[in-house]
Interface confidence: medium
């Protein structure tokens, strides 16, 4: 029997092909076999089918990087990594995606889901769109909606000071942040660490964080697979 999606464009299609174990998979942007991309798929959280695009867990990877690095991506997809803004832009241009953020700290966990998520192209400086919050972590990403991405060498935030420089990270900073998941791991100084303001505030660096995306209509697709 042939695969439902011979060239899956995201982890949800890989899952609908029958792959239900979290791990590394190859996806194909727009289903084009020449645009292969290795990603980590979370096949367990809330039904699975998520492309993980950020993971913080131990501080071994340096996230204080330049524009070029954030555009391309860096790190080990099994460990700490950033998938890359160019990849995120291409993936979210394929259709309507939702964002999930999973946070864990000393046995506590929280999550946030935004049912409309996209990252613009390089020309827009990878402008963020996040709407339709639900979850337990609090709506911290709302502050960053509509912002362009900023790194220490390309300052697109609305603050007079360079937010990425001030907080030793990179993000869709505004003036400056409520979310700083690419901040300094383990740094509990005000606004410097891995922060999700509405969960742990600005003076606490969260131990584990993942950002992930999947198609907004995944539930419908999943039902179709089960019926099939």
């Amino acid at each position: 029997i042939g695969l439902l999606y011979p060239f899956p464009r995201d982890c949800s299609q890989a899952m609908l092909n029958g792959d239900t174990t979290s791990g590394l998979y190859t996806i194909y942007i727009n289903g084009d076999k020449t645009q292969a991309l290795e990603v980590y798929c979370d096949m367990t959280s809330d039904g699975g089918g998520w492309i993980v695009f950020l993971r913080r867990k131990n501080g071994r990877e340096d996230f204080y990087r330049n524009w070029k690095a954030y555009a391309a991506g860096f790190g080990d997809r099994r460990e700490e990594f950033w998938l890359g803004l160019d990849n995120l832009s291409k993936i979210t241009a394929q259709g309507q995606y939702e964002l999930r953020v999973d946070l864990q700290d000393h046995g506590e966990s929280a999550y946030a889901v935004y049912d409309r998520f996209s990252v613009g192209d390089a020309k827009s400086r990878y402008k963020l769109k996040v709407e339709g919050y639900s979850g337990t972590a609090g709506d911290s990403m709302n502050y960053h909606n509509g912002r362009s991405f900023s790194t220490y060498d390309k300052d697109t935030d609305s603050a007079i000071t360079n937010c990425a420089l001030s907080y030793k990270g990179a993000f869709w900073y505004k003036n400056c942040h409520r979310v700083n998941l690419m901040g300094r791991y383990g740094d509990n100084n005000h606004s410097q660490g891995v922060n999700w303001f509405h969960w742990k505030g600005h003076e606490y660096s969260i131990q584990f964080a993942e950002m992930k995306l999947r198609p907004s209509n995944f539930r419908n697709l999943e039902g179709r697979r089960k019926r099939a």
């Epitope: 709302n142 509509g146 603050a159 007079i160 000071t161 003036n175 606004s191 303001f197 600005h202 003076e203």
Partner: antibody, heavy 120, light 107 residues
């Protein structure tokens, strides 16, 4: 706990100047943006000015732009509002407020206010 | 500047009743909407920030909702200590602006 105490208010003639101060305690002062908000007698609240935690960014309402200057001395845990060319419509109770974060965001905790009366 | 319009201006309500105050922004402000309570002779007190986040220490009978341009503050069961004036405020852009206030008094 957070404490904000305003001072410097009083009766002043139109066209003259006044400098308000706000002494802050109970929190790390330079970690938070600060605001001045005023309330004319029997009226609603009007945001006047704000300043980021570092003091690098300042913001003003159109009604006071060019006349009022906000500043802070992080070493002294103090916030200031220099008010020049005062008008009768500047008569109000002036509150100093601590923001919820280091950036211009949400006025969270307020002082009890200092009264400014502009009259000849 | 963004104009904030609250309604009603006055709301006579019996103790125990549900109270709903609405606030409309003149332009889209995402969820950057805060609610304050002010009692006579006292400083305003933050109740809700970012449309729906309850400030620490504020009773759970207070709740906020809305996004974009239309927002609501709800008091599920009015208590005697809740009689006050309530203001909405947008922190989406500077200058930050307040609504004209809603006075909740005893019916």
């Amino acid at each position: 706990q957070v404490q904000l105490v305003e001072s410097g208010g009083g009766l002043v003639q139109p066209g003259r100047s006044l400098r308000l101060s706000c002494a802050a305690s109970g929190f790390t002062f330079d970690d938070y943006a600060m605001h001045w908000v005023r309330q004319a007698p029997g009226k609603g609240l009007e945001w006047v000015s704000g300043i980021s935690g570092s003091g690098g960014s300042t913001y003003y309402a159109d009604s006071v732009k060019g006349r009022f200057t906000i500043s802070r001395d992080n070493a002294k845990n103090s916030l200031y509002l220099q008010m020049n060319s005062l008008r009768a419509e500047d008569t109000a109770l002036y509150y100093c407020a601590k923001d919820i974060s280091a950036v211009m965001d949400v006025p969270q905790t307020w002082g009890q206010g200092t009264m400014v009366t502009v009259s000849s | 500047d963004i104009q904030m319009t609250q309604s009603p201006a006055s709301l006579p309500t019996p103790v125990g009743d549900r109270v709903t105050i609405t606030c409309r922004a003149s332009q889209y402000i995402q969820g950057f909407l805060n609610w304050y309570q002010q009692k006579p002779g006292k400083a305003p007190k933050l109740l809700i920030y970012d449309a729906s986040n309850l400030e620490t220490g504020v009773p759970s009978r207070f709740s906020g909702s809305g996004s974009g341009t239309d927002f609501t503050l709800t008091i599920s069961s009015l208590q005697p200590e809740d009689f006050a004036t309530y203001y909405c405020q947008q922190s989406y852009s500077t200058p930050q602006t307040f609504g004209q206030g809603t006075k909740v008094d005893i019916k």
